[in-house]
Interface confidence: medium
């Protein structure tokens, strides 16, 4: 109640391994939408414009420092004339909430790479994905944007029981001891530990022994 | 004239994961969004979420935990999962287009094309 | 979350008489994301009205929708044996979309 119609309401940042999308309601009626982002100099940067959509991706612009903090903004404008304002002479427009890309964006679902047995070790390898952030027209992976603050947790389990162990590293490898003649499942879970908030992802799918992705040498 | 035409398993035991794809004969996805609805046997109707066709989507809040929607442009089709179901989730599931239609200064929004329904039933 | 609620639960009409049925919202709801549906037993939901006023193709003209705001009324003038059904309000602008609990229009 109390939003005047045209509006944008409810500005919600969607950030997955810095893919990031700021979303808000509701669908237009007689009017566009059109976001603006605030870059490093503090100026307002023009995305979206004109755009019937509820969604902006605004990833190119918040890869270019993602430790930077960011705000944007919906403004709204009669349909077909985005120089059109309102009474006070400004265009109506709602702020979203800060955003800061390091701190904020959501960890993606891990994917185990490859686990290798060597006798009674497995060593297990996560994949380093790949992020939109770039450096010297590089993409770069997890790993290398959060370094060492990124870990990985391993749970892994006798395939015959469900008692689950777990342990933990700061690269993208565990080495576990097994029990020789066992077959064993694993999943990881990305975690950032200095965080307060989106400090998990959600569990990786479980690879087991005796699949495609393992390796067994004596 | 477009049609929906879905499919996916009727009988699920708790804790499993519901699966439904509707694919769209006579017409593109592109331009439209598409939705999927539930209703509990006897209850009305309630609406689970939606997808565009560049794959931006919308999600109940009741439900969003639990719930993925995705499309294929190449087959012309979308589908929802719904993990984690309890007998609560048995329901008449109908995916439908949802359109927002032109007019002159605006746009108007509503389900215009549905499916037909495919019952879901958890149970132990 | 909006909050559509439809009123009365239940219409007990004979055939030639006139059906109103109300869908009231709990926050005022833009005209053009309120529709009208119908449903009989065992088939999906019909659109029947789309922008609070617009009749959908071949929909009878038997069928009006009017109101604003966060009250809207769908109005049967002469009612049909095939009229008889399940009618649902939803506004399909703020997410979630709602749908009203529904009406039954019943042979009297």
């Known amino acids: 109640a109390g939003t005047p119609p045209g509006k944008a309401f409810n500005l919600t940042w969607i950030s997955t391994d810095f893919k990031t999308i700021l979303e808000w309601q509701p669908k237009p009626t007689n009017y566009t939408y059109t976001v603006q982002i605030s870059d490093r100099s503090r100026n307002w940067k023009y995305k979206c414009t004109g755009t019937t959509d509820t969604e902006c991706d605004l990833t190119d612009e918040i890869v270019k420092d993602v430790n930077w903090t960011y705000e944007a903004r919906v403004l709204s404008y009669p349909a077909g004339n985005v120089e059109s304002t309102g009474s006070a002479g400004e265009p109506l427009y709602e702020n979203s909430p800060e955003f800061t890309p390091y701190l904020e964006t959501n960890l993606g679902q891990p994917t185990i790479q490859s686990f290798e047995q060597v006798g009674t070790k497995v060593n297990v390898t996560v994949e380093d994905e790949r992020t939109l952030v770039r450096r010297n027209n590089t993409f770069l992976s997890l790993r290398d944007v959060f370094g060492k603050d990124l870990i990985y947790t391993l749970y892994y389990w006798k395939s015959s029981s469900s008692g689950k162990k777990t342990a933990k590293t700061n690269t993208n490898e565990f080495l576990i001891d097994v029990d020789k003649g066992e077959n064993y499942c694993f999943s990881v879970q990305a975690v950032i530990p200095s965080r307060t908030v989106n400090r998990k992802s959600t569990d990786s799918p479980v690879e087991c022994m005796g699949q495609e992705k393992g390796e067994f040498r004596e | 004239q477009v049609q929906l035409q879905q499919w996916g398993a009727g009988l699920l035991k708790p804790s499993e994961t519901l699966s439904l794809t509707c694919a769209v004969y006579?017409?593109?996805?592109?331009?439209?969004?598409w939705s999927w609805i539930r209703q509990p046997p006897g209850k009305g109707l309630e609406w689970i979420g939606e997808?565009?066709?560049?794959?931006?989507?919308r999600y109940n809040p009741s439900l969003k935990s639990r719930v993925t929607i995705s499309v294929d442009t190449s087959k012309n089709q979308f589908s929802l999962k719904l993990s984690s179901v309890t007998a609560a989730d048995t329901a008449v599931y109908y995916c439908a287009r949802d359109t927002p239609y032109y007019y002159e200064g605006g746009y108007y929004y509503y389900m215009d094309v549905w499916g037909k329904g495919t019952t879901v039933t958890v149970s132990s | 979350e909006i909050v559509l609620t439809q009123s009365p639960g239940t219409l007990s009409l004979s055939p030639g008489e006139r059906a109103t049925l109300s869908c009231r919202a709990s926050d005022s709801v833009d005209s053009s994301y309120l529709a009208w549906y119908q449903q009989k037993p065992g088939q999906a939901p019909r659109l029947l009205i789309y922008?609070?006023?617009s009749r959908a193709n071949g929909i009878p003209d038997r069928f009006s929708g009017s109101g604003s705001g966060t009250d809207f009324t769908l109005t049967i003038s002469r009612l049909e044996p095939e009229d008889f059904a399940v009618y649902y309000c939803?506004?399909?602008?703020?997410?979630?979309?709602?749908f009203g609990g529904g009406t039954k229009v019943e042979i009297k």
């Open positions: 997808i565009g066709a560049s794959g931006s989507t």
């Open positions: 006579g017409g593109s996805l592109s331009g439209y969004y």
């Open positions: 922008g609070a006023f």
């Open positions: 939803q506004q399909a602008g703020v997410v979630p979309y709602t």
